[in-house]
Every structure is written in C-alpha cells, then in structure tokens.
Interface confidence: medium
C-alpha cells in the first residue's frame, strides 16, 4: 500500500453577492460586523467548493476582505490535489466547476443558494501560492480597503509605528483602471513597496516592486489592468516619517490605436507612447500603431530611449513588453544605451506596430519617436550599426558599434584619405594650405560645402566643411559663419595636484570649478556657459550627495584654504545626470550643474570651449588636466590648483590595457611610466587641449582609472565629443534626467580609483 502524493494548490479570488451591500464596518477587519460576515461568507465558500468534485480535496479557506458595489468577497482556499491531477485543475477549470454549481438547479440548502445570491459571472479565480497567503497574513494587522471614486485623488495614509507591513486593497468602478502614484520624500530608506494586479499580494500578479528611496524614479505612477490593485508596504527601518507619499485615482482606459501618415522628410515627426505615459504601462496594454510612409524610398526608424528590442524564442514570454513588427516578434528590455529599430519598407501600405504586455509585471511607460530614413543611404557619411540601429562615425579609431564593424575594412583610420591614391594623411594636415596628397586633394574644397562625414564640421545650416576642427579658429569656414559663433571661450586669463603636477597661476585655467559640500572640496568641474558647469556623474552617486541643494560651486579659485578677490561662488539650482550613466561600467560619466545665477566673466572666470561632435583630438597630442585632487594615491587633496600635461592615447591601446572595459564614451591619457595622472578629488575636472588658434577645448572629464599615476594604467576620461549632443540638449532646455534626479550609483572623487 502506497499513500497518494498530494500537493497543496492555493487559489485566490473574489465573488459578488447581489443581495448584500458593502458597509463601512465591513471595510474594517477589527469590526464585529466584519468578523461575523467573513465567518458566514467563509462557510458559504466552503459549501460551494464541497458541493463540486473539488470537495474531496478541500483543505481550508478564508474570506479576508470585502469590497464595494454589490458586496464583493475576497477569498482564498487551499485544495490538496493528487500530484497526477495537479495540472488539470487550473484556475480556469476550478472557476468553471464553481460557476456550473452556481448555475445548476440542484435543490441544495447550502447558503450559496439560499442566503447568498452569488453572481456566477463575477466569480474570479486566480492561481496563488502558500507564500502569497503568508504575505497576506503578515499584513492583516494593517489591512486597508479603499474604494476609489472617479475624479477622486485618494491619499493613502502610511502605517503607524507598531506595524512593519501594510496592505492597501484598492478597488474602483469596473469600467475604470486603478492608477497609483508613489513619490519618494526622503533620500535614504530601506522600505519596500510592491503593487499587484489583484486584490491580494499574488506573486504571479506582481506589477512592480521598488526597494529603497529610488533616485532613478523619484515619482512613479503605476497602472493596474483594471479596477483592482493591492499595494504592500514593508517597513525597512524605524522612522517617524513615511518615506513616500502614496495616492490613488480611478482613470479611464486610454486607447492606443493610431493611424498616421508620415511626410517625406528625414527629421523626427512625432512619437508613440503607452497610455498615461510616463506612467508604468498597464498589464492589459495592447497598442496598435499603423504608420503609412509616403514612398518606398523611405524606411521607418523608431528611436527608443533606454529601451531596446531583440529577437526572442517563440516559447519565451517577453517580460518587458512584446512587439510585433512586420510579423517579427521582438521583446523589449531596458538598457542604458540609445537604440533605434529600423523597419525597411517593402509594401506601400505602411507598417503596423503592436505593443503588448504579456505578463502582469510591467515597467516604465514606453515612448518611441519616429522618423523616416533614406533606404538607399540610411547614414550619410557615417556607418549604420546593425546591432543598435544607430548611425556612428566610421574609421575614426573608436569602435562605436558593439561588434566593431565601424572600424573594419577602413582604408584610413583616424586619418584623411587622399582621393588620388587612397593614401592616408594625418587630419591636422587637411586644409592647412600645404598640399600633402599627390595632387593636393587635401587642400581642395576647403572653402566650400562638402558631404558630411566623420571628421567634417556641421554648420548651423546643416552644410558641412572639410577643414578639421574649424570652430573658433578666427576664420569663418561655414557659409553662415556658425563655426565662429559662441566663441567667447577657451582663452586663458592672466597668464601663460594632480599626481606629478605643478602649481597653476591665477587665471591660467579660468574655467576650473571646485564643487564643494559644506566647505569641503569633493570634485572638479569646468565652466562651459554663463550658468552651466560640467562635471562627472559619479560625483553624485552617494545618496548623501544627490541633492543639488547641498552643493556650492567655486569659480576663479586658486587655493582651497583661503579666499581671494578673483573667486566667486554659486549655489546649484538644478542637477542633470546623463540618463545612461552606469556606475559599474563608468559609462556616460557626465553631469551638468545649472548655477543659481549667471556668471560675470573676468580674467579669472571664463568658460572653456566645447568641441563639436566631429572635433578630432589626435592621439599623441599633449593636453592638460587640472584640479585640487590628491598628489599621491591615498593622499589628501591639494591646497593649490595643480596642473599636469598628459598625452592622449589611441583608443585601441587604451582598450587593450584595460581589458576592453573602455567604451566609446571614454578617452585615455597619461604616460607609460605613470607618475602624471589625475587622482581622488580631481573627478569631473577638465582635460583640455590647446588648438593652434590658442583656444582651449574640453576633450575630457576626469572619470576613473586604476590607482593614481600607476605605471601602465593611464587615466580614463569621459570623451566629451561623444556626449556633446546631450550637453547641447540640456543647455538649450531639452531635458535629460533633471531636477534632483540621478540615474545610478568608484571613482576619482570621489577619481573613481579601484
């Protein structure tokens, strides 16, 4: 004889009782009415299950809450099912068995027939687990039911001191959806908040869970698939303050079925977004966007931000959104990189793009910009990286494309290619009035527009000039003169520690900034405009340094321990961290500080020049770093501003030395013997290079490195030319993770030194 193996299967759900109504007392678990009604309803549920073939498996049940409308009972029950039958008793089958019993004409005296008028249509059965019941039970001491009326913004009161875990059971009108808004009000906390697409905390119906006071999303809004949601709050540490504000609304379902016809132009034409963007998309999201293209000369480009698409096996669910484009199934995933999906046009009727949430787990709303591209030449003068759909500079010595194809098959890498015989000459020799190519092709078309390419400068009128680095060189190269605009920059003032450095003189580096908290120098920076200072994002990685209010910026400063007439100080009104900054890889290590009032330029305070995206800083060139950082590894910060010359290092050698951890947004400089380098406290400070015109351009920002001045490990800097588009976007008011917002959490500062 062998005992039958059984498994405990947990079901959760709700039913509506048409002949009863909800009362306020039933919303409070501690009331006599609740205890009485829940006992009776639990008995009714037990009888209902027992009267079907499930009765032999019945173990236990509970009615844990009531809801509005005709009285809604929220329950769970456990069946001990033989192992071999486990898969056959799905929630759908169980619901069918119970509905059949409710609809049957059996002459039973059970309360579900006599006392309670149970609505068979309204029966909901969901799969649950024993752990879900444990979580639910742990919150019952602080269980709050709220009905959310249309148009009402209902604040949810945080738990009191005695409780460590609370559950809000939210319900709204059936034709609306629940939307919860969570706003973190404190910098540091250890609290957890989980939101479920069900009345109770069912793991399989989790929409999202957040831990700690998230600086990435200081405010988040989350949608349920319908009119029910459960929010569980778990306290992480004793506090007299709620670390967040919670409020809830009932909102109408928003349609996202769109038909659009695009115009025959190549700039961005609009965007598609999930309902209630930037709210988290709902677990029931299904969007269908149909875009019609004016001709088959064009393809459609979808531009994503911190989200990308990839092929997925058909038997695997998409966990962050499913996309169907031209019968291709793609899965979305969040990433700290830009991405474009290019859709070649093969039929004139356009393309339909479907976005669906396949599981309850969702994520931040998705917004995608759309534009057309020329199918015959998708990236004029550049290389189309098939991995991410982006146009990247080709043959410039930097592998921008993850597969490195932009640097393959180059006739000339980081050099100019002569037309006559494909000879390569160094870029500074182009348009320098001295022919280097056999027939002088390096000196042709220097006064006229040329097709845009990796090293051509793009004028404001979008035409391009051949001369490398024409910005602010005293000669107007663009027809519209835009290469000589915004040139009040890069000139030293009065004259002309860093490891191995020498002391600077007053006005020598007038763009140098000292970023301080409570009188202590933390990071360097550089003035780039009258209200803007640029620095490294990693300076703000600590929670205690994340708020702009904490920081003071000093300009024109020479010595840390004393003030002198040439220096000025500013508070920070806004802080912008690059949205793709990743603390582990140090990628996109750049931040912008908006000062509380404009800078008045002087001999000791003036901005450095920003390079164009096409600006070429030649490997081997000697440039300068400045800062008050430590003069030896592990040492204290310097009192007097230090300067040191370093040599720019080719990207391939740099990447080799750091075992390929160097991204295209990084630039290396230093010496084989070390000794001259940036160090702790120099983070965010400028790496500047002098152009033949005498102006200084910002090539890099002190970011990270292995130790300081160590042999064979040079300093790694943020490559400004690769983040200049974002910088310009922020400076012109185009956004980029602003406010106190930060994106992620080593560093030179803070020199992110290992």
């Amino acid at each position: 004889y062998k005992a039958e193996v059984t498994v405990s299967q947990v079901y959760s759900g709700s039913l509506r009782v048409l002949n009863r109504h909800f009362s306020q007392d039933l919303g409070r678990r501690e009331s006599i009415a609740f205890r009485s009604e829940s006992a009776k309803a639990q008995k009714m549920l037990q009888e209902l299950v027992a009267s079907t073939r499930l009765g032999t498996y019945y173990n236990s049940s509970s009615v844990y809450s009531f809801g509005e409308g005709p009285l809604t009972c929220f329950f769970w029950f456990i069946l001990d099912i033989p192992e071999y039958q486990r898969l056959t008793l799905s929630p759908e089958v169980v619901r069918e068995l119970l509905v059949d019993e409710l609809l049957s004409n059996s002459s039973t005296l059970a309360s579900y027939k006599t006392e309670y008028e149970v609505d068979p249509e309204g029966l909901v059965i969901l799969e649950a687990s024993v752990n879900d019941i444990v979580v639910l039970n742990s919150t019952l001491g602080c269980y709050r039911y709220s009905y959310v009326n249309p148009g009402q913004v209902l604040p949810l009161k945080g738990p009191d001191q005695q409780t460590t875990s609370c559950l809000w059971h939210l319900q709204g009108p059936e034709d609306l959806m629940i939307k919860v808004r969570l706003e973190w009000t404190r910098v540091d906390c250890r609290d957890r908040v989980a939101m479920y697409d069900a009345a109770g905390p069912l793991e399989k119906r989790l929409i999202t869970s957040v831990y700690g006071c998230s600086r990435q999303e200081p405010v988040m809004e989350v949608l349920a698939s319908g009119s029910v949601m459960a929010v569980v709050w778990k306290k992480g540490m004793h506090s007299y303050y709620d670390p967040f504000l919670l409020s809830v609304k009932s909102v109408a379902f928003q349609d996202c079925q769109v038909n659009l016809t695009l115009e025959g132009r190549l700039d961005t034409q609009g965007f598609l977004r999930t309902p209630y963007y930037p709210s988290y998309y709902s677990p029931s999201t299904h969007c269908s966007w149909h875009l019609t293209v004016p001709s088959l000369d064009y393809g459609l480009a979808l531009w994503f931000d911190a989200y990308a698409l990839r092929r997925q096996k058909y038997n695997r669910l998409c966990t962050q959104g499913q996309w169907m484009i031209q019968n291709r199934r793609l899965c979305g995933f969040r990433t700290l990189q830009p991405y474009a999906e290019r859709i070649p046009m093969v039929a004139s009727d356009g393309v339909t793009i479907n976005f669906t949430s396949q599981i309850s787990l969702t994520g931040p709303g998705v917004q995608v910009y759309y534009s057309l591209y020329n199918q015959s030449d998708p990236c004029p003068g550049e290389f189309l990286c098939s991995v991410n759909g982006l146009c990247v500079p080709a043959c410039d010595g930097i592998k921008d494309c993850p597969n490195g194809l932009d640097e393959r098959n180059c006739v000339c890498r980081a050099m100019f290619q002569c037309q006559e015989d494909s000879t390569c000459i160094s870029l500074p020799r182009v348009c320098d009035r001295q022919p280097d190519c056999l027939n002088g092709s390096d000196e042709e078309q220097c006064q006229e527009g040329v097709p845009c390419g990796t090293f051509t400068f793009q004028c404001e009128d979008r035409s391009c000039v051949k001369k490398p680095n024409p910005e602010c060189d005293g000669q107007s190269d663009c027809r519209d003169g835009s290469d000589e605009q915004h040139c009040d920059c890069g000139l030293q003032g009065l004259s002309s520690r860093i490891v191995g450095g020498t002391v600077s003189s007053e006005g020598e580096w007038p763009w140098q900034a000292s970023l301080q908290i409570r009188g202590r120098h933390i990071c360097g920076g550089a003035l780039i405009a009258d209200r803007w200072v640029i620095t490294a994002a990693h300076c703000f990685q600590e929670d205690s340094m994340a708020s702009p209010k904490l920081w003071t910026v000093f300009l024109g400063k020479m010595r840390q321990n004393s003030r002198w007439p040439g220096e000025v100080s500013f508070k920070v009104s806004r802080l912008f961290l690059h949205p793709y900054h990743e603390e582990d890889s140090h990628d996109y290590d750049v931040a912008l500080l908006q000062l509380d009032h404009p800078v008045v330029y002087s001999a000791t305070v003036r901005p450095v020049c920003l390079p164009a995206r096409s600006h070429f800083f030649e490997p081997g060139q000697h440039c300068w770093i400045t800062g008050w950082g430590a003069q030896r590894e592990g040492g204290p910060v310097s009192n007097t501003l230090q300067k040191v010359d370093v040599q720019l290092v080719p990207q391939d050698l740099c990447s080799e030395a750091y075992r390929y951890q160097v991204s295209p947004r990084m630039l290396c400089a230093g010496y084989r013997k070390g000794k001259k380098d940036a160090c702790q406290g120099d983070s965010g400070g400028p790496l500047v290079c002098r152009e033949p015109s005498g102006r200084w351009f910002l090539a890099g920002l002190v970011s990270w490195g292995l130790g300081c001045g160590r042999p064979n490990f040079f300093g790694v800097y943020t490559r400004v030319t690769r983040v200049i588009n974002w910088i310009q976007q922020v400076l012109t008011g185009g956004g980029g993770s602003g406010g106190g917002g930060s994106h992620h959490h080593h560093h030179h500062g803070s020199h992110h030194h290992h």
Partner: antibody
Framework: EVQLVESGGGLVQPGRSLRLSCAAS????????MYWVRQGPGKGLEWVSG????????GYADAVKGRFTISRDNAKNVLYLQMNSLRPEDTALYYC?????????????????WGQGTTVTVSP | QSALTQPPSASGSPGQSVTISCTGT?????????VSWYQQHPDKAPKVMIY???KRPSGVPDRFSGSKSGNTASLTVSGLQAEDEADYYC??????????FGGGTKLTVLG
C-alpha cells in the same frame, strides 16, 4: 653616447640553453621599453620579444613563445633573453633595441637605437 | 603572426623616386597606425627612417616619406641618392604586445 652592447652568443647544440645580455648606457634605461630582434643568415629582421620599462607587460613572437624569456634589471641597466630548447632555426644575429620616446605612455613600437648584435648558432 | 609582405627588390636611377610597399592584414597595418620603416646597410644595424606611418625622426632627410592605405603601407624615397642603396624593412604593431616585420626589400640605385 647612447649605446647598447649585446653579449652571450655562441655555438650551442639543439635543445640546449643560452642567455643573452644587453648592457645599456648613455640614457635612462628604465624610461624605455626594450626589444630583442633577430636576423637569420641572409634573411630579414624578425621581432622576438619586448618588455615594458617595469617588466609588467611582455610580448613574444609565436615562434619563441614558451621557450624564450625576456627580463631586465633596471638597477644594472641590463636586458636579458633566456633561450631554452634551442632549435637550428633559432640561428641568427640577435639585436637588442630600445623603444623611441620612453617618456610617453604608449609605445610607438619603434626601435630608435640598436646594438651591433651577438651571433647565436644552433648546430648539432 | 605572419610577416608583412614586401617586394624582394626595387630599383631606380639617381634623382628618381621609388616606392616600396608593405602589405599586412586588417589586424596589423590596417588596424593600427603604428607602421615603421627601417634602413639597413650591409653588416650594419638597422636605422629607423619613418614611424607612425608618416613621421620622420630628426636627422632623416625629407626625401623619405611614409603613407598608408588600407592594409598597405608605403615608403617613398624621392631624389634617389647612391647612399640610399640598402635593405628596407617595414614593421607594424599587431596587437597583444606583438610586433611584426616585413620580409625586406633590397633597394638598388642604378648607374
């Protein structure tokens, strides 16, 4: 005067070992990457090995990898090449050479000063 | 790593120009801009004439110039003189701390 003087060459049987030395003078030895380059009788130049100024980066040609070891003593201004399991095809004039511009971080992989070479003959 | 390919010989009359080619792969000459050229007279040590594709060390006459196109580098000697008769070798960095030389080209000055 900048000078490199090789020594230690000679006639040796296959399978045996030999150690070459290169004495440097007239420049700051530990500022420079150093190389060994060989030239077989009537043949062209063949790069053998290179070593960074502080010995933490070393490279070998595939033909000698696992048999030859490059090293340096910065205190004595001497570069060494330990050659084990010698083969007849290792017969050559062995030059010691220094890397140009030792001051810079990265190598140009350029040999701007050469010694006169020392001859190694591997024969039964 | 395989040797770079050079023509075994090249020649020219005094005053003429001559170009010597050096062909590698996309992993050496084609990838890095670290191409050097050496001159070697009989029974003498080599002397560097060009480095980083086209840079000339001080003391090297400007008659010597270097260039590169794709996987091929070239050394051009213009205004050929009798003392230019020698063997010429190219070299390139090949990644992973390795350097590779060409097989060498014997340059003959005619007449």
């Amino acid at each position: 005067e900048v000078q490199l003087v090789e020594s230690g060459g000679g006639l040796v049987q296959p399978g045996r070992s030999l150690r070459l030395s290169c004495a440097a003078s007239g420049f700051t030895f530990d500022d420079h990457v150093m190389y060994w380059v060989r030239q077989g009788p009537g043949k062209g130049l063949e790069w053998v090995s290179g070593i960074s100024w502080n010995s933490d980066t070393i490279g070998y040609a595939d033909a000698v990898k696992g048999r030859f070891t490059i090293s340096r003593d910065n205190a004595k201004n001497v570069l060494y090449l330990q050659m084990n399991s010698l083969r007849p095809e290792d017969t050559a004039l062995y030059y010691c050479a220094r890397e140009k511009d030792g001051d810079f971080y990265y190598n140009y992989f350029v040999m701007d000063v050469w010694g006169q070479g020392t001859t190694v003959t591997v024969s039964p | 790593q395989s040797a770079l390919t050079q023509p075994p010989s090249a020649s020219g009359s005094p005053g003429q120009s001559v170009t010597i080619s050096c062909t590698g792969t996309s992993s050496d000459v084609g990838f890095y801009n670290f191409v050097s050229w050496y001159q070697q007279h009989p029974d003498k040590a080599p002397k560097v004439m060009i480095y980083e594709v086209s840079k000339r060390p001080s003391g090297v006459p400007d008659r010597f110039s270097g260039s590169k196109s794709g996987n091929t580098a070239s050394l051009t000697v213009s205004g050929l003189q009798a003392e230019d008769e020698a063997d010429y070798y190219c070299s390139s960095y090949a990644g992973s701390n390795k350097v590779v030389f060409g097989g060498g080209t014997k340059l003959t000055v005619l007449g």
